[in-house]
């Protein structure tokens, strides 16, 4: 589910900028699956740069190969490069590896822009910085490729989080999440902190950044603020949820909530932008825009193409309004929200200006293929995937870029009628799994 | 049709303020489709952008003039106007105002220049 | 920052002949380029934006082709009136201030 504006995303700061932290709130929720409280082994595993994707570490093989692994919600494939590439620096060597096994067969997968085709195994698979276990889990081992590396990302392969469903080349290729679970005692929940960086950064700062956390098996309390709200997973395919209401400073979109959701949405740690189908991007960007009237941008800012710039620390983060999204609840009529700020969806763009500027793309951008909470979103909260009890959390993330006078929020709970109607119902044809591509 | 006419002294002493005035013709400037910019060239040199203003009031500085530039405007005389202090003989230069056309992007229409020489 | 430099500095034609000039920014600006004339004691004027749109008014002698880090700008046919300094500018960073150094093209 890489490519096209779904370009792996940006790295970031561990700590909450200008030492602000919500005050804790009691967690009302109900117990979750796994380990609870101190995942520290797990604490800051994430590397990135800006729009370039987040990485773990992983071990592949036997001996162990270290690669750096792009951390992909949108998609359920473990892939990792397993040829030269001039972007690579390392790749699997499948040949040094004395528990490698060849499935002798082929994998194939075509984006909107570019794509990968490899060869299906199956090895032995560890993440230093994750759960002490080795798992003996399915690897495409990429062979040739179009556009899908990014030179410089400092990744040489992807893990695809998402479910079987999604699979290539079909539902048949268990993803490594769920040989994780199938072949450990480890809970089947993970949870993502991504951490923006919120200014731009030079190539020092960001290869030295860090980009976040990815917690194994359960929630560590010391990554978010108040309280976790959860939204059931719809189906399990992408992780696909329900948006029912959508505001811009507190404006309501005023749509059929079904738009929102036209044709899904998905929680996709792989693609950089907040994206909205085209009436709702149209009809968002339309009240951004009045919103912060007082300033005027050039018509390819709004299409994510134009940089704007600023003298360094006088971006005016004020004129630009909140952007709300409502999310079904786990209760009936019930739903809550999740606030980002400007700092969330203007990305920072590196080495385009003098160090005396500030240069920033608007991060949000049109979709044909539904909603995608991508970096834009999840940068500002610590992101829960509770696969065992088909729901994904939301809070507040500690590490999230914010000001004195706004902060990125959690919130709940609404009163919201027939929510179910709000998701789309999408024909089933044999093609209805080929989406893979989202440009 | 749309006009701009640049207009203030030619001969600047060193450290003092030199000013000019872009008066609009023939449309509005407070148009919602433009920005107003001011832009130099030192004689047989390359174009320097300056700043830009729209007609709320919202500037945008060259980075490396920022310290001494003002740009403002005044929609009930049609203009717009701008300051630059602490003048030096590299600020002479032949001044441009212009408008900001094509989705705020581009410079559509230029005034003719007024040469501005600073010197004591 | 993104710097942009035009070749050759000085082109020297016949009329009629066709003149072919380049401006290349040091990192990619995408399509958003614009092409300016200007002649001796006049204001530069809109020819080309976009990398590739002729402005109001500009005759289809004048073209403009790339994208990314290359563009070319194009006069098919060199009238008399066409003998100027020919500079591009990038409005991909925004506010639009980086022009190119200038190419000037004379009469041979």
């Known amino acids: 589910t890489h490519l096209g504006i779904r370009l792996p995303l940006r790295s970031g700061l561990a700590g909450p900028p200008l030492g602000l932290r919500l005050p804790r709130e009691t967690d009302e929720e109900s117990e979750e699956p796994g380990r609870r409280g101190s995942f520290v082994e797990m604490v800051d595993n994430l590397r990135g740069k800006s729009g370039q994707g987040y990485y773990v570490e992983m071990t592949v093989g036997s001996p162990p190969q270290t690669l750096n692994i792009l951390v992909d919600t949108g998609s359920s494939n473990f892939a990792v490069g397993a040829a030269p590439h001039p972007f690579l620096h390392r790749y699997y060597q499948r040949q040094l590896s004395s528990t490698y096994r060849d499935l002798r067969k082929g994998v194939y997968v075509p984006y909107t822009q570019g794509k990968w085709e490899g060869e299906l195994g199956t090895d032995l698979v560890s993440i230093p910085h994750g759960p002490n276990v080795t798992v003996r889990a399915n690897i495409a081992a990429i062979t040739e490729s179009d556009k899908f590396f990014i030179n410089g990302s400092n990744w040489e392969g992807i893990l695809g989080l998402a479910y079987a469903e999604i699979a290539r080349p079909d539902d048949s290729l268990e993803p490594f999440f769920d040989s994780l679970v199938k072949q450990t005692h480890i809970p089947n929940i993970f949870s993502l902190q991504l951490c923006g960086a919120g200014f731009p950064l030079n190539q020092t700062e960001a290869l030295a950044s860090v980009g976040g956390s990815m917690i194994i098996g359960g929630i560590d309390h010391s990554l978010y603020t108040g309280r976790l709200w959860y939204t059931p997973i719809r189906r399990e395919w992408y992780y696909e949820v329900i948006i029912v209401r959508v505001e811009i400073n507190g404006q309501d979109l005023k749509m059929d909530c079904k738009e929102y959701n036209y044709d899904k949405s998905i929680v996709d740690s792989g693609t950089t932008n907040l994206r909205l189908p085209k009436k709702v991007f149209e009809a968002a960007v339309k009240s951004i825009k009045a919103a912060s009237s007082t300033e005027k941008f050039p018509d390819g800012f709004w299409l994510g193409e134009q940089l704007v710039c600023w003298q360094a620390g006088t971006t005016p983060w004020n004129i630009f309004p909140v952007i709300s999204l409502y999310l079904m609840g786990e209760v009936t009529n019930q739903s809550f929200r999740i606030t980002i700020l400007p700092q969330q969806y203007l990305r920072p763009v590196e080495d385009v200006a003098t160090s005396q500027d500030d240069c920033y793309k608007f991060a949000v951008s049109q979709s044909s293929t539904g909603t995608v909470m991508g970096a834009v979103i999840m940068e500002g909260f610590y992101v829960v995937f509770d696969r065992a009890r088909k729901r994904i959390g939301f809070a507040v993330s500690a590490c999230h870029v914010h000001d004195e006078f706004r902060t990125a929020a959690v919130e709940g709970p609404f009163v919201t009628a027939d929510m179910e109607d709000c998701g789309y119902n999408i024909p089933q044809t044999d093609e209805s799994t080929l989406m893979t591509g989202r440009a | 049709q749309l006009q701009l006419q640049e207009s203030g002294p030619g001969l600047v002493k060193p450290s003092e303020t030199l000013s000019l005035t872009c008066t609009v013709s023939?449309?509005?400037?407070?148009?919602?489709?433009?920005?107003w910019g001011w832009i130099r060239q030192p004689p047989g040199k390359g174009l320097e952008w300056i700043g830009q203003?729209?007609?709320?009031?919202?500037?945008f500085y060259n980075p490396s003039l920022k310290s001494r530039v003002t740009i403002s405007v005044d929609t009930s005389k049609n203009q717009f106007s701008l300051k630059l202090s602490s003048v030096t003989a590299a600020d002479t230069a032949v001044y441009y105002c212009?408008?900001?056309?094509?989705?705020?992007?581009?410079?559509?229409?230029w005034g003719r220049g007024t040469l501005v020489t600073v010197s004591s | 920052e993104i710097v942009l430099t035009q070749s050759p500095a000085t082109l020297s034609l016949s009329p009629g002949e066709r003149a072919t000039l380049s401006c290349r920014a040091s990192?990619?600006?995408?399509?958003?380029l614009a092409w300016f004339q200007q002649k001796p004691g006049q204001a530069p004027r809109l020819l080309i934006y976009d990398a590739s749109n002729r402005a109001t008014g500009i005759p289809a002698r004048f073209s403009g082709s790339g994208s990314g880090t290359d563009f070319t700008l194009t006069i098919s046919s060199l009238e008399p009136e066409d003998f100027a300094v020919y500079y591009c500018?990038?409005?991909?960073?925004?506010?639009?201030?980086?022009f190119g150094g200038g190419t000037k093209v004379e009469i041979k």
């Open positions: 023939g449309g509005s400037i407070s148009s919602s489709s433009y920005y």
């Open positions: 212009a408008r900001l056309g094509h989705g705020y992007s581009y410079f559509d229409l």
């Open positions: 990192q990619s600006v995408s399509s958003y």
């Open positions: 203003i729209y007609y709320s009031g919202s500037t």
């Open positions: 500018q990038q409005v991909y960073v925004w506010p639009p201030r980086t």
